[in-house]
């Protein structure tokens, strides 16, 4: 349940099924408000935020980016197409995630519940999408050395990857939120 | 120039069925989930049904579940809706209507088709 | 089933603001029930104003604004004009179908 329904919400003979469009819609609305507060930290924190130097370390990443062939914007959407590239996104996001744990100070729940909700969504989404099979894991082996990979990182760099996944997921909810209003 | 045309409404007895037709042109119609929005004499709007943008989900109104199927053909660019056993209470004036992407774009309501269910 | 309510009637004086609100029988109206409002006159198709809380659609005046107020969607008209008289209906995405209230109809004085 995204923490942004309050109790009496819960209770409202309203209350929709997991795969609902408003929960699934609720739920990316949290994860992007938790998003928020961390970028406020990473942004008060060090000044990556206005950094031109993003390309160095974007080098050194591969995230998950909507593109035309994905079938998530306007022109050219493919429904199918679109919600398999956002599961898979969402499973290849989550090894960045795991990377922002122990990276926030005053914001480390907040972290973790930007990482649990993000499992939940993509529970959410596997209900939704329960007659799709083209959908692939994560391998874990690669995924534990990209972290290591990550982890060993000089610290300018570090602050930077954070900074990148921060916005670069953000980036990627807002456009699956967007599609997701057209399945 | 965006448009949708509603069509196949008239004069029948309860009971009957009838299918009615919206062709849109103007914009990508397999890019939008569209919708059925009815509104009896005198009355408020009241939504009926939407379809998936390639059809995959459908979605009722309790007061319809059952009764109604909702369709699209991408390829023709037409919505249908297929009422069976109809009722007085669903006389009214039938729009159909595409759910827009951003709030900038222009959303267009054709004139509607009127349904009459009448002994 | 949840009901979606708006006040029957409001009037506003030529030039003055009104505020329609838009709220659920049970539990408060977020941001992920996508408020929209439309404009109907007599004899006339709806209009729709605003898309997703406080997006205007493409056309609409900037005298009309939507926002989240409390636990309800609101309209508000800045400096009615009397062409604003009609009826206003606002929908709301429940769960995966959307629910229409039952309309205010505004009154434009003088």
């Known amino acids: 349940v995204p923490p942004g329904e309050d109790s009496k919400d819960v209770a409202a003979p309203h209350r929709q099924p997991l795969t609902s469009s408003e929960r699934i819609d609720k739920q990316i609305r949290y994860i992007l408000d938790g998003i928020s507060a961390l970028r406020k930290e990473t942004c008060n924190k060090s000044n990556m935020c206005e950094s031109s130097k993003e390309a160095l370390a974007e080098n050194n990443l591969n995230l998950p980016k909507m593109a035309e062939k994905d079938g998530c914007f306007q022109s050219g959407f493919n429904e199918e197409t679109c919600l398999v590239k956002i599961i898979t996104g969402l499973l290849e996001f989550e090894v960045y995630l795991e990377y922002l744990q122990n990276r926030f100070e005053s914001s480390e729940e907040q972290a973790r519940a930007v990482q649990m909700s993000t499992k939940v969504l993509i529970q959410f989404l596997q209900k939704k999408a329960k007659n799709l099979d083209a959908i692939t894991t994560p391998d874990p082996t690669t995924n534990a050395s990209l972290l290591t990979k990550l982890q060993a990182q000089n610290q300018w760099l570090q602050d930077m990857t954070t900074h990148l996944i921060l916005r670069s997921f953000k980036e990627f909810l807002q456009s699956s939120l967007r599609a997701l209003r057209q399945m | 120039q965006l448009q949708v045309v509603e069509s196949g409404g008239g004069l029948v007895q309860p009971g009957s069925s009838l299918r009615l037709s919206c062709g849109a042109s103007g914009f990508t119609f397999s890019s939008h989930r569209m919708y059925w929005v009815r509104q009896p004499p005198g009355k408020g709007l009241e939504w009926v049904s939407a379809?998936?943008?390639?059809?995959?989900?459908?979605y009722y109104a309790d007061s319809v579940k059952g009764r109604f199927t909702i369709s699209r053909d991408n390829a023709k660019n037409t919505v249908y809706l297929q009422m069976n056993s109809l009722k007085p209470e669903d006389t009214a004036l039938y729009y159909c209507k595409r759910r827009t992407w951003y709030g900038g774009e222009y959303d267009y309501w054709g004139q509607g088709t009127q349904v009459t269910v009448s002994s | 089933q949840t009901v979606v309510t708006q006040e029957p009637s409001l009037s506003v004086s030529p030039g003055g603001t009104v505020t329609l609100t838009c709220g659920l029988s049970?539990?408060?109206?977020?941001?992920?029930?996508?408020p929209g409002w439309f404009q109907q006159t007599p004899g006339q198709a709806p209009r729709a104003l605003i898309y997703?809380?406080?997006d205007r659609h493409s056309g609409v005046p900037s005298r009309f604004s939507g926002s989240i107020s409390g636990n309800k969607a609101a309209l508000t008209i800045t400096g009615a004009q009397p062409e604003d008289e009609a009826d206003y209906y606002c929908a709301l995405d429940i769960g995966d179908i959307t629910e229409f209230g039952g309309g205010t109809h505004l009154t434009v004085l003088g």
């Open positions: 379809i998936s943008s390639s059809g995959v989900s459908t």
């Open positions: 049970s539990g408060s109206v977020t941001a992920s029930n996508y």
């Open positions: 997703s809380t406080n």
